[in-house]
């Protein structure tokens, strides 16, 4: 099938990084500067993406692959292929329509992006709060309150060591 197709369509022989040039009797021509073709058999090359403004180049364009962009420091990528840059906030904040705002009491954000999330409710798992939450950190849940009742130890002491063949004194 491939041989039949190539006999019918000489363009199918053109590899990635080239295009089938109709102006030159359908011979394979290299993609011009600042353009690429990522698959064979292309009749045109695509224009390379330019990482401008708040975007910076993560990977240069080549004859066979498009450039890849990321965001300048203080911003992070959103969308497929980093189509938009969104401003970072500090840990303990979230981005609102009015800019970066501190997380409300009872919520936290340990990243520079995303929303403030509620602290874990330790009691739902029958546990107690070992370390309080902050704007930047979730609570740390510890053993259940029953395990910490007076006189009870949360750590079981190891059994006394016994030598083989000897009964305890």
């Amino acid at each position: 099938f491939e041989r039949t197709r190539s006999l019918q369509d000489p363009c199918s022989n053109c590899p990635a990084g080239t295009f089938c040039d109709n102006n030159r009797n359908q011979i394979c021509s290299p993609c011009p500067p600042n353009s690429f073709s990522s698959a064979g058999g292309q009749r045109t090359c695509d224009i390379c993406r330019q990482c401008k403004g708040v975007f910076r180049t993560r990977k240069e364009c080549s004859s066979t692959s498009n450039a890849e962009c990321d965001c300048t420091p203080g911003f992070h990528c959103l969308g497929a292929g980093c189509s938009m840059c969104e401003q970072d906030c500090k840990q303990g904040q979230e981005l609102t329509k009015k800019g970066c705002k501190d997380c409300c009491f009872g919520t936290f954000n340990d990243q520079k992006r995303g929303i403030c999330r509620p602290w874990t409710n330790c009691s739902l798992d029958g546990k107690s709060v070992l370390v309080n939450g902050t704007k930047e950190r979730d609570v740390v849940c510890g053993p259940s309150p029953a395990d910490l009742s007076p006189g009870a130890s949360s750590v079981t002491p190891p059994a006394p060591a016994r030598e083989p063949g000897h009964s305890p004194q």
């Epitope: 993406r49 401008k52 403004g53 708040v54 975007f55 911003f75 959103l78 189509s83 938009m84 840059c85 969104e86 401003q87 981005l95 329509k97 009015k98 800019g99």
Partner: nanobody, 122 residues
Amino acid sequence: QVQLQESGGGLVQAGGSLRLSCAASGFSLDYYAIGWFRQAPGKEREWVSCITASDSSAYYADSVKGRFTISRDNAKNTVYLRMNSLKPEDTAVYYCAAPRSDCFHYGENDYWGQGTQVTVSS
């Protein structure tokens, strides 16, 4: 032709002031937030300030808070960045940008100016 043009840059001594302008032509700034960025030699581009379209709310980077003031005059289709108490570390090319969405999101089709050089000598 749609474009943004910065002006007002120059050489100033530490402690001095400058007022940068960002003028739009070919479109109305009324409906756009305008952000200022700067890029020092060998450094990454850095966000400086932004003013919203809806209510002219102003936002600033911590490094310029209390020293820089952003304002807009929609009748003149221009946004200004007043820079007081300038420091040598403020030396950079300053760019204005008109994001299509808001002060906190920038995309590939936003309008950008060519930049104006600010040099602060000690």
